[in-house]
């Protein structure tokens, strides 16, 4: 496997592009069991209807790979565990990509992104100790291809869930 992006290995802030700029996805640093900071993106606007919060990564080179794999580690709160929000709370998010030769795209319209999948929390999860708390970490892998341009952007769309993206890894498999 060749890693193209690993959010856990980025030094400092990830600095991905959130839309809207305020009120949606927020970059939040948490400490793992070794007291090392983990950069996460979190959103939990579960009280207000019609959420449409987007988060876009930096440009990712495909290094000639025809097909890439996206591994997302995330937590997703069960709406039943959040009091009184059953009408507005959701339990999925959407994953998109946009191919581009331009590594400095300023504005990408929502309708330019291609949907990869709707992601939901699985019944299986890994328990991770974070200080005095246990985090239930879901892992989902999706693949995209065939790719033709020099690189691509990933986007995550929140529609009203309580979610934290803990790690995003993009890789391809060597022939």
């Amino acid at each position: 496997e060749v890693t193209l992006l690993d959010s856990r290995s980025v030094q400092g802030e990830l600095g991905w592009i959130a839309s809207p700029l305020e009120g949606g996805w927020e970059e939040v640093s948490i400490m793992d069991e070794k007291n090392t900071p983990i950069r996460t993106y979190q959103v939990c606007n579960v009280m207000e209807p019609s959420q449409n919060n987007w988060l876009r990564t930096d440009w990712i080179t495909r290094e000639g790979a025809q097909r890439v794999y996206i591994e997302i580690k995330f937590t997703l709160r069960d709406c039943n565990s959040l009091p009184g929000v059953m009408g507005t709370c959701k339990e999925t998010f959407n994953l998109y990509y946009y191919e581009s030769d331009n590594d400095k795209e300023r504005f990408i319209r929502e309708n330019q992104f291609v949907k990869i999948d709707t992601i939901a929390a699985d019944e299986s999860f890994t328990q991770v100790d974070i200080g005095d708390r246990i985090m239930k970490l879901n892992t989902e892998i999706r693949d995209v291809g065939p790719l033709s341009k020099k690189g691509f952007y990933l986007a995550f769309q929140d529609v009203g869930a309580c979610i934290a993206l803990v790690s995003v890894r993009v890789f391809y498999k060597k022939a």
């Epitope: 305020e22 009120g23 949606g24 927020e26 939040v28 948490i30 996460t40 979190q42 959103v43 939990c44 606007n45 937590t75 997703l76 709160r77 565990s81 959040l82 974070i130 708390r133 246990i134 985090m135 239930k136 309580c162 979610i163 934290a164 803990v166």
Partner: nanobody, 118 residues
Framework: QVQLQESGGGLVQAGGSLRLSCAAS????????EAWFRQAPGKEREMIAA???????NYANPVKGRFTISRDDAKNMVYLQMNNLKPEDSAVYYC????????????WGPGTQVTVSS
Amino acid sequence: QVQLQESGGGLVQAGGSLRLSCAASGRTFNSYAEAWFRQAPGKEREMIAAVTKAGTTNYANPVKGRFTISRDDAKNMVYLQMNNLKPEDSAVYYCNAISPLWDEYDFWGPGTQVTVSS
């Protein structure tokens, strides 16, 4: 041990105002958001307002435009300014943290009673 202490409730006439306060001790304010909840007799507890570390606020429909949530991380305090109160706002009000990462509701404070008379 986490301790949450709500205060500022009372009896007020419809159309009046109250400011609730919540003091948190025994935990750092490193959660994604702090929130206010309420529970009226015979009803389920409901979340009505939240404020993230970055200052983003969101509100449940019944209180939108009348209630304002704020936080002071230096003092480990969360506030709820309630204006134009209605009899249906009568409830016990609680504060707590919310996080996408884990269930924060291991501990609840005693709450503070708000009664709005018509």
